[in-house]
Interface confidence: low
């Protein structure tokens, strides 16, 4: 006995063959053996069967001698035996039909699961391996988990079910919600402006929810909320936002935040959170501010640095073109009594300068100027 | 950069086993599939299998599944393959392979030459 | 398991000709609108290099004479114009379902 492998919501076209390459009679049974369609001379005709509406053949093809059986919109209890009636003989197919769903909704936050159910018919016991578009695989019958997704996970899952040696594709599109970092960091001198920029790594027609960022400054006790904000439509409006700092926002995507001034009470860790409409769960993006100030105070040179700085970061302060006089894994270095000359304050990783500030000192009758 | 630094050339004796090491660097290991493929002298590549080390999750070539064993360690990000009851078949060259995105291994380890011989 | 039949096994071409080296799979290696095979070029004494992704997309890094076509069981790979750097062996594999395969390889010599 012949095996198809049909899938829900598809077409599928059964095939029987007459030995003679002409018109004749047919009929198409189910294995109830209730009509389904057959011929009478060039006109297709329908049997009482469930398939009524959803059963044709190719009329094209009856003079070559091939009768095809055409059953569109598959449904999972389509399977069944079906049997061709022509020349006095009975060609029969057996029809499985199996359909592929994601566990509630394709677009999932970043760290949640995905569950892909299979709907088989009974007495089929089909095994099925997806592909994620990051290249894994993934086994297993009837239902297939992937927990903690990640942003690779976004794109088309192409899932094959096998069963009598045959096998039968579906493509699902996956999105998942995340911002496009987990964390960044941003090195500003003591004054510039800062930009804090959150861009998702997804897009929808419509994007609906709130947000708010949390700040924890490395000289505070304790976090606060700098801003809230929601998001409609993909249009961003402020909620309520502190006084100090008072931070600006942008009123589209991706969102955008402006810090007037990089001081270093500011210097610190921010959570951005997105609670995104109907969806469990939130979006996250760390942020990070890291801010430099080189002053000169009578004798003493300083360069300072606050703000989550690695262990392995370096901050030095050297002469213009010469060698670095101090350099140290801390977060503030001096020099006493400084040479004139333009001093450089660096805080570098493994050589690449990350911030760079400059402080002109006047021959020691005058004062400091910082360009 | 993408790096595969495989361990060094193994000589052994019938029957024994031989564990080598395969250690990645430049980007994040449990994210993708490594693979093992087997290249005897002046012959073809033949795929072992694949090891997904965010679960440990391993799939052998048939006719591998008793000579090969592949484990990942997390924390060092290095892929191992055990080869176990040696015999003069097993002498070959052994590369690791990154499998990138929907296909193709984009990165190679540099090979390990496994000689058996009494 | 799907076989991969490479051919010919072996090819001689001129510096500056087209060399065209086929692959056939005993059953289709396609997956809706992608096609999961794959070519690699191997020198002596050095791995395998990724030349050719998903049947038809040049690796980075690769030269543009390097060209991949092909779809369901055959694919065909084709150097134009060949150049002496190009001697080596040319495999092809498929990673559309497990096990992958390779073909057994195509050494192209110059003539």
């Known amino acids: 006995k012949k095996v198809v492998l049909g899938k829900k919501g598809d077409t599928v076209e059964l095939t029987c063959t007459a030995s003679q390459k002409k018109s004749i009679q047919f009929h198409w049974k189910n294995s109830n053996q209730i009509k389904i369609l057959g011929n009478q001379g060039s006109f297709l005709t329908k049997g009482p069967s469930k398939l009524n509406d959803r059963a044709d053949s190719r009329r094209s093809l009856w003079d070559q001698g091939n009768f095809p059986l055409i059953i569109k919109n598959l449904k999972i209890e389509d399977s069944d035996t079906y049997i061709c009636e022509v020349e006095d003989q009975k060609e029969e197919v057996q029809l499985l039909v199996f359909g592929l769903t994601a566990n509630s909704d394709t677009h999932l936050l970043q760290g949640q699961s995905l569950t892909l159910t299979l709907e088989s018919p009974p007495g089929s016991s089909p095994s099925v391996q997806c592909r994620s578009p990051r290249g894994k695989n993934i086994q297993g019958g009837k239902t297939l988990s992937v927990s903690q997704l990640e942003l690779q996970d976004s794109g088309t899952w192409t899932c094959t079910v096998l069963q009598n040696q045959k096998k039968v594709e579906f493509k699902i599109d996956i999105v998942v919600l995340a911002f496009q970092k987990a964390s960044s960091i941003v090195y500003k001198k003591e004054g510039e402006q800062v930009e804090f920029s959150f861009p998702l790594a997804f897009t929808v027609e419509k994007l609906t929810g709130s947000g708010e960022l949390w700040w924890q400054a490395e000289r505070a006790s304790s976090s606060k909320s700098w801003i809230t904000f929601d998001l409609k439509n993909k249009e961003v409006s402020v909620k309520r936002v502190t006084q100090d700092p008072k931070l600006q926002m942008g009123k589209k995507l991706p969102l955008h935040l402006t810090l007037p001034q990089a001081l270093p009470q500011y210097a610190g860790s921010g959570n951005l959170t997105l609670a995104l409409e109907a969806k469990t769960g939130k979006l996250h993006q760390e942020v990070n501010l890291v801010v430099m100030r080189a002053t000169q105070l009578q004798k003493n040179l300083t360069c300072e640095v606050w703000g989550p700085t690695s262990p392995k970061l370096m901050l030095s302060l050297k002469l213009e073109n010469k060698e670095a006089k101090v350099s140290k894994r801390e977060k503030a270095v001096w020099v006493l009594n400084p040479e004139a000359g333009m001093w450089q304050c660096l805080l570098s990783d493994s050589g690449q300068v990350l911030l760079e500030s400059n402080i002109k000192v006047l021959p020691t009758w005058s004062t400091p100027v910082q360009p | 950069q993408v790096q595969l630094q495989q361990s060094g050339a193994e000589l052994a004796k019938p029957g024994a086993s031989v564990k080598m090491s395969c250690k990645a660097s430049?980007?994040?290991?449990?994210?993708?599939?490594m693979h093992w493929v087997k290249q005897r002298p002046g012959q073809g590549l033949e795929w072992i299998g694949y090891i997904d080390p965010s679960t440990g999750y391993t799939v052998y070539l048939q006719k591998f599944k008793d000579k090969a064993t592949l484990t990942a360690d997390k924390s060092s990000s290095t892929t191992y393959m055990q080869l176990s009851s040696l015999t003069s078949e097993d002498s070959a060259v052994y590369y690791c392979?990154?499998?990138?995105?929907?296909?193709?291994?984009?990165?190679w380890g540099q090979g390990t030459l496994v000689t058996v011989s009494a | 398991d799907i076989v991969l039949t490479p051919s010919p096994a072996s090819l001689a071409v001129s510096l500056g000709q087209r060399a065209t080296i086929s692959c056939r799979a005993s059953?289709?290696?396609?997956?809706?609108?992608?096609?999961?095979m794959h070519w690699y070029q191997q020198k002596p004494g050095q791995p395998p290099k990724l030349l050719i992704y998903r049947a038809s997309n040049l690796e980075s890094g690769i030269p543009a004479r390097f060209s991949g076509s092909g779809s369901r069981t055959d694919f065909t790979l084709t150097i134009d114009p060949v150049e002496a750097d190009d001697v080596a062996t040319y495999y092809c594999q498929q990673s559309k379902e497990d096990p992958y395969t390779f073909g057994g390889g195509t050494k192209l010599e110059i003539k």
């Open positions: 392979a990154k499998e990138g995105g929907i296909g193709g291994f984009a990165y």
């Open positions: 430049g980007y994040t290991f449990t994210n993708y599939l």
């Open positions: 059953e289709s290696v396609d997956s809706y609108d992608n096609s999961f």
